[in-house]
Structure formats: C-alpha cells, structure tokens
C-alpha cells in the first residue's frame, strides 16, 4: 500500500512544483520524493523497507499519475542509499537518496529544489508547503493528481509534550501542525518547503493523521547536509 496522504489539502497547480517526485514500486505510487540534484532524489528510508523484491522507479515531471503529460518521465534507479543509521523501528534518520539511471532532463516541469544547509530551526508559525499523492481522506481515496497543503511549523517543545510525541522529536526533526490539514504515512519522503527552500522530508513512521495532538514529523535536511553532500559527491 502507498505510504502516506495529504489530508485537508487541495489539488496543486499543475507542474508548479517541478522538484516533486513519485517514488514507485512495480509501477504504483509508493512515496513522495524531491529532486535535489540532476541525478538524485531525496526520499524517506522507510519507503523501501518492503521493496526488496520489487522494481523501484522515480517519476518526474508529473501532475497526474495516470494521464499522459509531455514532461512526465519514469527513471530507473541506479542506486538506493538509505541513511546508515536509519532503522525500521524508529523515525530517526529517515532519509533515502536515490540515484537515477541518468541525469534528469530538466525543464519548466523538472527542476531540483534548493535545500537548506544552515542548521537552524524554522521559526514556529512559519507556513510551509507539503505536497504528495497520498490518500486524501480517512476512507482511503487516492488522488490521481498532486495535492498540497500549507502547514504552520510547530515548536519542538509542544511537539515533545506527552500528549503529542512525548520526547521523540530530536533536534534533527521538526513538526508541523496537524489540525485536520496534515501530511501522513504515504506522503512519506515528500518535501516540506518553506520560503522556496527544502527544509524537511515527511517521515514515514506510522501515526494518526489529522489529529492536532499528533503533529506531522519531518526530517530536517539541514541536519544531514554532510551526509547528503557525501553521497552526492
């Protein structure tokens, strides 16, 4: 099953997020991803946990998953590099770099997104954009077209309260509010974009969606700049 969803969002403007990737398993959407370099897509490590025997590919330039679009192209994956410290039972270090079989053909609908390198928290209340093809309601309806939602960043202390995530949010993670509008499991790997810069990647741990007491959790890319640079080098 696809990992994740956007709840309470709306259809994105077609091709307005040219960095957006669909990580696919055996031809079906599995997770979100974000193009960070011509030949590299950043996603979440947990996305490939159950993909051992399947064919992993990356779809770029898409708005609709099913309809033909001139900018759409499916790339094979040359190499999958999960963060070495990622583990199945934790949300920590939930990052994955996918090297495409060739450099992506760039254009208006396919373009890497600058990512944050300065290791400083995004200010609470900042509105950030998250997008994905995950299911759009609790009944499990899957969208064909890309959805997005704007979410305010939540301070880490609130996110760490016992009734929220009870101390699980390390300095390498960040939270966004989840009051009916939310990302969730299957949008995992997708980008959290603040001020036009990639700040976070949707984690793929299981949690209830759309409940304000269980904020969305995102891996802070700035905290992993050295690792990302070392893989891309």
């Amino acid at each position: 099953p696809p990992r994740g969803r956007i709840l309470g969002g709306r259809e994105a403007e077609a091709h307005a997020r040219p960095y957006m990737a669909s990580v696919q398993l055996n031809g079906a959407h599995l997770c979100g991803g974000v193009l960070v370099a011509e030949q590299w897509v950043l996603s979440a490590a947990h996305c490939l946990e159950d993909a051992a025997d399947g064919k992993v590919q990356v779809l770029l330039g898409a708005h609709s998953l099913s309809q033909p679009e001139p900018s759409k192209r499916l790339y094979d994956v040359l190499r999958a590099v999960p963060h070495p410290d990622s583990q199945p039972d934790t949300i920590d270090h939930d990052l994955l770099l996918l090297q495409l079989s060739e450099k992506a053909t760039l254009g208006p609908a396919v373009r890497p997104l600058p990512w944050q390198r300065v290791d400083r928290d995004v200010a609470p209340g900042t509105l950030c954009d998250v997008a994905g093809w995950g299911i759009v309601n609790h009944a499990g309806r899957r969208p064909d077209s890309l959805q997005h939602v704007l979410l305010p960043v939540l301070d880490r202390a609130t996110c760490n309260r016992r009734t929220h995530h009870d101390g699980a949010i390390t300095e390498r993670l960040m939270c966004a509010e989840s009051n009916r509008r939310d990302s969730c499991k299957g949008d995992s790997g997708g980008p959290l974009v603040c001020g036009g810069v990639l700040e976070g990647v949707v984690t793929s741990g299981s949690r209830v969606c759309g409940n304000r007491k269980k904020p969305g959790i995102y891996t802070r890319v700035a905290s992993y700049a050295a690792w990302i640079d070392s893989v891309l080098a």
């Epitope: 202390a157 101390g167 209830v208």
Partner: antibody
C-alpha cells in the same frame, strides 16, 4: 546527560515571597516543556503548572494560579518559579521536571520552609 | 480534577514475592487522541520520583522487566513480579490525559 539542578533550600517568613530556580543541562532547553510539582511532607505530589521555554507561555493548575508565577531565562537555560504570600501550608519540597518522555527527568527538589 | 485513588496505602511484602498496586481514576483517562496517559513513578526515601511505566504498560528505558503495568479506562494495576530490596519506596500513579494532571495518593512498599 540530562540534569536539572535546583536552587538551595529556603527559609522564609509568612507573607513573604520566594523564587526558586531549576537549571537545565545536557539537552536543548527550548525543546521541552518544564513542569513544577509540590510535595508536602509525607504527602503526594501536586502539579503546579508548566511553561514553554520557547515563548515563556505558562499554564497553571487553578489551585496555584494566585500562588505561583513561572518564568524562563533561555540565555541561562533556567526555569524559575516565584511563590508569593507564603503561609505554613506552602512549606514543601518543590520539584521541576522536564516533560518528554513523560516526567523522565526531575530536579533534586528545593525545600521551602515557611516559619516565623 | 481527576481523582486518582490508590490501594493499598501500605503494602508489606517479603523479598522475592509478587506485589500488586491498584489505581482507579474518577473518570476515564483516555485522551482525545486515543492514548491513555497513565504513568507509574517510584519515589525512594529522600529522592525525586523515577519514571517506571508510561502509557499504561510501557516500561521506561532501564526499568527491569519485573515491573509491568496493565489496565484501561479507569482501572489500572502495577505488578512487581519478584520484589527486590531496591524496589522499596512509595509508588505513585499519575494521569496526564486531563488538565490538571494528577497523582494518586501513593502506596508504600515495605518489607514484611
């Protein structure tokens, strides 16, 4: 190692005020709420209130809203609690405790004795 | 406020025996997010409380597996399978689902 170091015991007169301190170390102070508890001798613990160190926003148990004022100083990673209009009923050990996970980390307690 | 009632007040046990402490809340302590924030703390003489169990049945890191928590709704139990000398002290249940959070009155575990 997470540590919460509380200020020394206080002997105060009835009607006076006292401010007790809780200095945090071993973690990022602004990443966790700080809670305060009271324990009278031989009795259970009572929750006084909590504070978000990011913005200094406190929440109080109604029972203590006219008794306690919670503040933080981010620059020194210190939470503090002022107790006012003290009576002998306020004689107790006062604890700070970090929230997350649960109350896993506590200060050693500050004994406040109210006596003429 | 949610009243947390612990029984017994005092529990004399022999080392190696099982001990069981009950905690009853005056209303359900299932939070609106679906979780139950029932915790158990041990306070040894002259010390601060130590977290043993969170969310009814989860042992905090470093807590021996002889401690186990169970229950739901309004009735909860802490069991110590084989009491050791270091387990002696006052045990408190705590609910964090409703504001204000509240502690039980305590159960003193002592040697018979």
């Amino acid at each position: 190692e997470v540590q919460l170091q509380q200020s020394r015991p206080e002997l105060v007169k009835p009607g006076a005020s006292v401010k007790i301190f809780c200095k945090a170390s071993g973690y990022t102070f602004t990443d966790y709420y700080m809670n305060w508890m009271r324990q009278r001798h031989g009795e259970t613990l009572e929750w006084i209130g909590d504070i978000n160190p990011n913005n200094g926003d406190p929440s109080y148990n109604q029972k203590f809203k006219d008794k306690a004022t919670l503040t933080v100083d981010k620059s020194s990673s210190t939470a503090s609690m002022e107790l006012r209009s003290l009576t002998s009923d306020d004689s107790a050990v006062y604890y700070c405790a970090r929230e997350g996970p649960s109350f896993a980390y506590w200060g050693q307690g500050t004994l406040v004795t109210v006596s003429a | 406020d949610v009243l947390m009632t612990q029984t017994p007040l005092s529990l004399p046990v022999s080392l190696g025996e099982q001990a069981s402490i009950s905690c009853r809340s005056s209303q359900t302590i299932v939070h609106s997010n679906g979780d139950t924030y029932l915790e158990w703390y041990l306070q040894k003489p002259g010390q601060s409380p130590n977290l043993l169990i969170y969310k009814v049945s989860n042992r905090f890191s470093g807590v021996p597996d002889r401690f186990s928590g169970s229950g739901s709704g309004t009735d909860f139990t802490l069991k110590i399978s084989r009491v050791e000398a270091e387990d002696l002290g006052v045990y408190y249940c705590f609910q964090g689902s409703h504001v204000p959070p509240t502690f039980g009155g305590g159960t003193k575990l002592e040697i018979k």
